[in-house]
């Protein structure tokens, strides 16, 4: 049976806003990951920058609902954003219990479907709330 | 097919600790959580908590927090769940199950000097 | 914790009859993501429990079609249309929305 969806938590330092209202998050002691369980969905989200060949966390936790991209088995990550030139935020959504603690892949910037770079432009605190 | 086997009856001594296993087979271990349910002499069943094996993490009946650790070992697919301190309180019928769905056979715990 | 109160909590029958055990919640299992954590389980008796229902009414695989589940927010139903042999044992309803998760106190079914 179902479990209620349990996701991997984490906020980088300096991220505006916070979606730990989204769900209760476990007594993990100092480990880990840090988990949380959703209270609206049943679906995980995550969020990395991508910075010519490094990956970033900056996101993770659960979705505030069901949407499409949620049916997801793993996190397949989509460009979203340019929060700075040679920078590109790439999101995921997916289904499963800790989907979101790693991407499947990232397709390598200036692949075909990353914004061009007249893409979408963000401070970097706002950059998130645009990927979401 | 899916099987969960637990290992075998413990006799303990009040005070002292018990750790039994639960080998899972039939599935990827890793994709389910773990839970343990203790079923005392005639009552109902309790929820003691559960793991995820893919990285251990936990979740407790707040009852259970301090009695009851839970640990996977991922290479040989196995639960494992120690119980400290024990009194005849513990003394039950422990089951370890995939996510509720499958249920090993139980192990019989009984606490006597 | 989520009391989970099932009733009757004995139930002599004669095989082929209609049985239905209530399980009153003392609160809401509806969750904030729509899904109702409500399951239902036997326990024949020297083994260990069987799930026969999840999400309140979706059969668990192997569950005859004469076992019905249904219900919502705190009072759920488990059916049984004809009552067979290997139907007898103690059944549970269970919740997990709530933490910690609990069982009802349980119905056992027997022969008259």
């Known amino acids: 049976p179902p479990n209620r969806r349990t996701c991997v938590f984490f906020e980088a330092p300096g991220v505006r806003g916070s979606t730990k209202t989204l769900g209760e998050l476990l007594d993990t002691g100092t480990e880990l990951p840090r988990a949380i369980r959703c209270l609206y969905s049943r679906c995980c989200f995550g969020i990395w920058n991508l910075t010519q060949d490094r990956a970033q966390v900056e996101m993770q936790g659960c979705r505030d609902s069901d949407e499409p991209g949620c049916e997801s088995l793993h996190c397949d990550p989509s460009p979203r954003a340019h929060p700075s030139p040679g920078s590109t935020l790439f999101t995921c959504s997916c289904g499963t219990d800790f989907c979101n603690a790693n991407y499947s892949h990232l397709p390598p910037p200036g692949s075909p479907g990353t914004p061009g770079s007249q893409g979408p432009q963000a401070a970097p605190g706002e950059s998130i709330w645009m990927a979401l | 097919q899916v099987r969960l086997l637990q290992s075998g009856a413990a006799l303990v001594k009040p005070g002292a600790s018990a750790k039994m296993s639960c080998k899972a087979s039939?599935?990827?271990?890793?994709?389910?959580?773990v839970s343990w349910v203790k079923q005392s002499h005639g009552k109902s069943l309790e929820w003691i908590g559960e793991i995820y094996p893919d990285n251990g993490i936990t979740n407790f009946n707040e009852k259970f927090k301090g009695k009851a650790t839970l640990t996977v070992d991922k290479s040989t697919r196995t639960a494992y769940m120690e119980l400290s301190r024990l009194t005849s309180e513990d003394s039950a019928i422990y089951y370890c199950?995939?996510?509720?769905?499958?249920w090993g056979q139980g192990v019989m715990v009984t606490v006597s000097s | 914790d989520v009391v989970l109160t099932q009733t009757p909590g004995s139930l002599s029958v004669t095989l082929g009859d209609q049985v239905s055990i209530s399980c009153r919640s003392s609160q809401s299992l509806k969750y904030g993501d729509g899904y109702t954590y409500l399951e239902w389980y036997l326990q024949k008796p020297g083994q260990s429990p069987q799930l026969l229902f999840y999400g309140v009414s979706n059969r668990f695989s192997g569950v005859p079609d004469r076992f019905i589940g249904s219900g919502s927010g705190t009072d759920f139903t488990l059916k049984i249309s004809r009552v067979e042999p290997e139907d007898l044992g103690v059944y549970y309803c269970?919740?997990?929305?709530?933490?910690?998760?609990?069982f009802g106190t349980g119905t056992k079914l027997d022969l008259k």
């Open positions: 269970f919740q997990a929305t709530h933490d910690p998760n609990t």
């Open positions: 199950t995939r996510q509720r769905d499958y």
């Open positions: 039939g599935y990827t271990f890793t994709d389910y959580w």
